[in-house]
Every structure is written in C-alpha cells, then in structure tokens.
C-alpha cells in the first residue's frame, strides 16, 4: 500500500525539512530560511515563530521544527506553547487587572503567579494548626488536638511544601 501511494503521490517521498514544490514538477525542495516542515509530504513549509518583545528564544527554529519561546525575567509563560507572557508578582501577592496586589489577611500565595488562597482550615480535616500561615505560606496542619497527649514535647514541623508551580509544558 505504501509503495502504491508513493507511486501515485510523489509528494509523500518529501521528508521533513522539505516541501513538495508544485512549481518545480513536485520536486522536494528545502524549506526556505525562517520556515520549517515537521512532517514529510507537506506542500508548504510553515513560517517560524519569532520570539520578540517580552518573549525570548528558548529553542531556535530549524528546518524541521518550530522555534520555542519563553519569557524574559519578570514574566512567566501562560497558555499552550507559551502563547503569552504574564507579569510576575512577589510571593504574598496576586496579579489582578490593576497589577500586583498584596494578599489579604487569611490568604497566601507562595508563588510569583496565581491567586491569593485562603489558609487551609485544619479543623475541617480534623487536624490542628502546627504553624500559623502568613501572606507567603499556608498554615501547616498537624495531628488532631486529641492526638496530642498533655505534656508531649513540641515537634518541629517540616518546612511547608512548595505550592504547585506551572512550568511551561
């Protein structure tokens, strides 16, 4: 079947990095500069993505793969393939439409992105607060009050785990 298809369609022989040039009797021509084809048998090459402004080049375009962008310092990627760059805030802040805003009391954000979230209410999960929350850190929940025997020595809690961070996929 593959052989038959190749006889019928000469374009199927054109590898990635080339295109099937109708103007030249369906000869496989290399992709022109600043373009690529990531699969074989293509009749055109795609224009390379350009990483400009707040975007910076993470991976250069080649004849077989598109360029990849990330964001300049102070910004982070959003969307599939880093389609946008969004301003970083400090820990203890959230990005609103009016810019970075401090977390209100009772909320925290330990990332440079995302929202201020309410501290975990340990009692709802039958636990007690081991370490109080701050603008930058959630509370640390420990055993339920009933599990702590009177006079038990205080336990030094582990450092709070890093909140989920979303690195560009």
């Amino acid at each position: 079947f593959e052989r038959t298809r190749s006889l019928q369609d000469p374009c199927s022989n054109c590898p990635a990095g080339t295109f099937c040039d109708n103007n030249r009797n369906q000869i496989c021509s290399p992709c022109p500069p600043n373009s690529f084809s990531s699969a074989g048998g293509q009749r055109t090459c795609d224009i390379c993505r350009q990483c400009k402004g707040v975007f910076r080049t993470r991976k250069e375009c080649s004849s077989t793969s598109n360029a990849e962008c990330d964001c300049t310092p102070g910004f982070h990627c959003l969307g599939a393939g880093c389609s946008m760059c969004e301003q970083d805030c400090k820990q203890g802040q959230e990005l609103t439409k009016k810019g970075c805003k401090d977390c209100c009391f009772g909320t925290f954000n330990d990332q440079k992105r995302g929202i201020c979230r309410p501290w975990t209410n340990c009692s709802l999960d039958g636990k007690s607060v081991l370490v109080n929350g701050t603008k930058e850190r959630d509370v640390v929940c420990g055993p339920s009050p009933a599990d702590l025997s009177p006079g038990a020595s205080s336990v030094t809690p582990p450092a709070p785990a890093r909140e989920p961070g979303h690195s560009p996929q």
Epitope: L78, C104, T120, L124, E163, H166
Partner: antibody, heavy 120, light 106 residues
Framework: QMQLVQSGAEVKKPGASVKVSCKAS????????MHWVRQAPGQGLEWMGW????????NYAQKFQGRVTITRDTSASTAYMELSSLRSEDTAVYYC?????????????WGQGTLVTVSS | SYELTQPPSVSVAPGKTARITCGGN??????VHWYQQKPGQAPVLVIY???DRPSGIPERFSGSNSGNTATLTISRVEAGDEADYYC?????????FGGGTQLTVL
C-alpha cells in the same frame, strides 16, 4: 496525553458516605491544584473544593464544610473526594478538574464524571 | 456571596452570531472563564482570562468583559455548538459558576 480518569458509578443509601477517586496521567499530580465540582440532574455546576496535591492543603465551599473531605495519594497520582451523611439531594455527577494557569483560576482539564445516586 | 447571572437559553440560526452574557457586580474587575458542556459529557474550557482561547478551540469563539457584564460570542454558529455554556470566576475564597445557558441552534 493529559487525562483525569474517575472511578465508576455508585449507589448509596441516605446517611452513608461515598469516596470518588480521580487518577491523573500525562502530567505530575503535584504540579496543579485539583478541584471537585458536582452537577445534579438537569442542574448547573457547583464547586465543592480543592486540594493542593503537594502539601495536602484544602479549601472547601461553605455549603459542604464538615461533610466533604478531599485527600490525595501522590504515589498513586490520585485525588479523592469523600462526601458523608448523604441525602437524596446529593444525587449528582461528581467531576474532578485540574486548575489551569490563567489569572483568576480556571479549570482546564476535567475527569469524565462519576454518577453518585443516593436512594433508599 | 458573589453571584453570576446567565440567561437560561439563547437560540440562533446556523451561520449567525450567538452572544451569551454573564452578569455580576463589577465583573469587569475579575477574570472570567467559559465552559461548554454537551449532553452526557464533562465541561470543556473554551475561553479563559476573559478572552483567551485554549489550543484546539476554534477562532469563532471569543470573549469580552467590562463593567457588570461578560460576554461569550460564537460567530458563524454550527450545529455542533449546541450545548450548555457556563461562565465562572474566582471570588476571594470560592469558585463561582453562572447558572448556565442552553444554546439552541435552530
């Protein structure tokens, strides 16, 4: 391929508890908050709460506080939602949903849903 | 608590433009996300952060948000767009959904 696969349908009696699981694949469970949303027959979407799979920190909608517990097992890449003291009004499809990256908290991937029927 | 109001239903002829609104107090200051849900299926994110489209969502879907109203616009409506649509915001300590709008393609 990013996927959230939930456990199968459940039939429960009033007063009982139900525990629904949500297994993540194609990404690291610890990387994103996980939410639970339910939908009663013919009704809209209702948010129940989230878990930070990294630390185990939770936040529950006021309506469900005291009845819902969201947990996770990172080694199994699975989040769980347990609802207790079930009543007929809890009959619904329960969804897990991954929090996305947008400003203001979006839910970018959803499980297929688990139908929980509460009937005597 | 914060409330989002959507019309229960919107009807539109194929090829025309559908507009679904989502009302909320000063909603323009919040980020609005929109979900499409077809019968028997899980919701799908179609617009996030007011107007951005996830990969795989057609350009026919667009969003806007200002004042007290956010709007999901579907241009050149197709039969396959028939579904329920929900708006959603984050409000200080909870995720809030609108009541949903059933889009009927005539």
């Amino acid at each position: 391929q990013m996927q959230l696969v939930q456990s199968g349908a459940e039939v429960k009696k009033p007063g009982a508890s139900v525990k629904v699981s949500c297994k993540a694949s194609g990404y690291s469970l610890e990387g994103y908050y996980m939410h639970w949303v339910r939908q009663a027959p013919g009704q809209g979407l209702e948010w129940m709460g989230w878990i930070n799979p990294n630390s185990g920190g939770t936040n529950y909608a006021q309506k469900f506080q005291g009845r819902v517990t969201i947990t996770r097992d990172t080694s199994a890449s699975t989040a769980y939602m347990e609802l207790s003291s079930l009543r007929s009004e809890d009959t619904a499809v329960y969804y897990c949903a991954r929090e996305g990256e947008a400003v203001g908290l979006d839910l970018d991937y959803w499980g297929q849903g688990t139908l929980v029927t509460v009937s005597s | 608590s914060y409330e989002l109001t959507q019309p229960p239903s919107v009807s539109v002829a194929p090829g025309k433009t559908a507009r679904i609104t989502c009302g909320g107090n000063n909603i323009g200051s919040k980020s609005v996300h929109w979900y499409q849900q077809k019968p028997g299926q899980a919701p799908v994110l179609v617009i996030y952060y007011d107007s951005d489209r996830p990969s795989g969502i057609p350009e026919r879907f667009s969003g806007s948000n200002s004042g007290n109203t956010a709007t999901l616009t579907i241009s050149r409506v197709e039969a396959g767009d028939e579904a329920d649509y929900y708006c959603q915001v984050w409000d200080s300590s909870s995720v809030v959904f609108g009541g949903g709008t059933q889009l009927t393609v005539l």
